[in-house]
């Protein structure tokens, strides 16, 4: 039960995280005009990964896309790449994890296959979350650097009494969305990896049959002493049922205190 809950929760947390990464990537407010200790302007500037916007006090908002690819800073391109890689990995991870969910039955998929898929999706979520966190952090670092540079050159002389005010930018809402979303995706991935451990069945190379012996409380299985004394790993999660022999496959299909629903 705990494994299914962990897997399900991991999936949901990752889903929220990836939705957040997508939202952050699309948001225009990666950097916003710093209003503190700045001349009050009748316009508010903010920038995203794909376009920059200006909101006037009239309420009119105008956004312009970055229609150049080569003219953009390398750092911005890197951030875009990291966010897109994060989204793609996350989306694939979500697709894989849907089929890996214990509560979803797809044909006669083995638990080992589900475990592998859970681990794969978990790793994908972890890498996706790291990509998002890295992307947002690179952008934040770029902002901090530019902020202090523009603070140093706050007023650029234009000859005589004329001055031009340099607009300073600070952290926008998208950065916080990205950090939180990346963190959630990372946590979801870790939960999927933890769930994978509980999902993985022990290796068996045979069909086990359980007998209820009338004389002794011993489970007779092919495999001699190892099976009868309980040292065999295949006795660990099995219940011996009254009412004759059942194959290992049949036993697993019944819920028991050791089974995970």
């Amino acid at each position: 039960m705990a494994v299914t809950a962990c897997q399900g929760l991991g999936f949901v947390v990752s889903l929220i995280g990836i939705a957040g990464i997508i939202a952050a990537t699309c948001m225009d407010q990666w950097s916003t005009q710093d209003l503190y200790n700045n001349p009050v302007t009748a316009v508010f500037n903010y920038q995203g990964l794909w376009r920059s916007c200006v909101r006037e006090s009239s309420g009119f908002t105008e956004c312009r896309g970055y229609f150049t690819l080569l003219g953009l800073p390398a750092m911005l391109q890197a951030v875009r790449a990291l966010m897109i890689v994060g989204i793609v990995l996350g989306a694939i991870g979500l697709l894989v994890s849907i089929f890996a969910l214990k509560c979803i039955r797809i044909g006669s998929m083995e638990d080992s296959a589900k475990a592998n898929m859970t681990l794969t999706s978990g790793i994908m979520f972890i890498v996706s979350g790291l990509c998002a966190i890295a992307g947002v952090s690179v952008f934040a670092n770029m902002l901090v650097t530019n902020f202090w540079m523009s603070t140093a050159n706050m007023y650029t002389g234009m000859g005589g009494m004329v001055q031009t005010v340099q607009t300073r930018y600070t952290f926008g809402a998208a950065l916080f969305v990205g950090w939180v979303a990346g963190g959630l995706t990372l946590i979801g991935g870790v939960m999927m990896c933890i769930a994978c451990r509980g999902l993985a069945p022990e290796e068996t190379n045979y069909k086990a049959v359980s007998y209820h012996a009338s004389g002794h409380s011993v489970a007779y299985k092919p495999g001699g002493f190892k099976a009868s004394t309980g040292f065999g790993s295949n006795t660990k999660n099995k219940k011996i049922y009254d009412g004759g022999a059942r194959t290992e496959d049949e036993v697993q299909s019944y819920p028991s205190k050791h089974d995970y629903v």
């Epitope: 005009q33 200006v54 009239s58 031009t164």
Partner: antibody, heavy 118, light 113 residues
Framework: EVQLQESGGGLVQPGGSRKLSCAAS????????MHWVRQAPEKGLEWVAF????????YYADTVKGRFTVSRDNPKNTLFLQMTSLRSEDTAMYFC???????????WGQGSSVTVSS | DIMMTQSPLSLTVTAGEKVTMNCKSS????????????LAWYQQKPGQPPKLLIY???TRESGVPARFTGSGSGTDFTLTINTVQAEDLAVYYC?????????FGTGTKLELK
Amino acid sequence: EVQLQESGGGLVQPGGSRKLSCAASGFSFSSFGMHWVRQAPEKGLEWVAFISSGSSPIYYADTVKGRFTVSRDNPKNTLFLQMTSLRSEDTAMYFCARNYYGNAMDYWGQGSSVTVSS
Amino acid sequence: DIMMTQSPLSLTVTAGEKVTMNCKSSQSLLNGGNQKNYLAWYQQKPGQPPKLLIYWASTRESGVPARFTGSGSGTDFTLTINTVQAEDLAVYYCQNDYFYPLTFGTGTKLELK
């Protein structure tokens, strides 16, 4: 047709108070920021205050800060300018104007005259 | 506060002439975000409220005759009236629409010869 009509002007004693109103019609008042601008006799234009569509933010000219208060009643399509501690230099024609693209003022009222004198 | 300096203070012209008046701001009114200059031009006739002619330094307000042209960027702006007509006699003001407090220029009075 967009119309702005100021009212409430008149003669006021120095140190006195006055409240000007600006009735708006012909447009969605609650969607526009509004300005107050004044013009002293035979002088140029002086911006007084701005109030955004949702009543925040509000900005004032340094000369009136702390003495004048701009407010609005969106359901009643009315803009207000509460003036206190009036001085002789506040004597002017007061105009209300609608905020437009580029933060310019596209429609103006006819003005309301305020005279501060003893 | 931003200082808006207009020149000349008055202009005496004859009908049909081309007129140019200038406006200089103490700080750049160019917004880097959209590359727009936040400067407006108004026309005020005696006994009337001002009328918006130009915003964003060069965008003509609807209903304003094509003979009115705004130009300039940063700190230096110009209003040009291509063929002055009798009804254009008025005082022309430029306005800083970028920094609060918003400020108007001293005005340029256009008179007939």
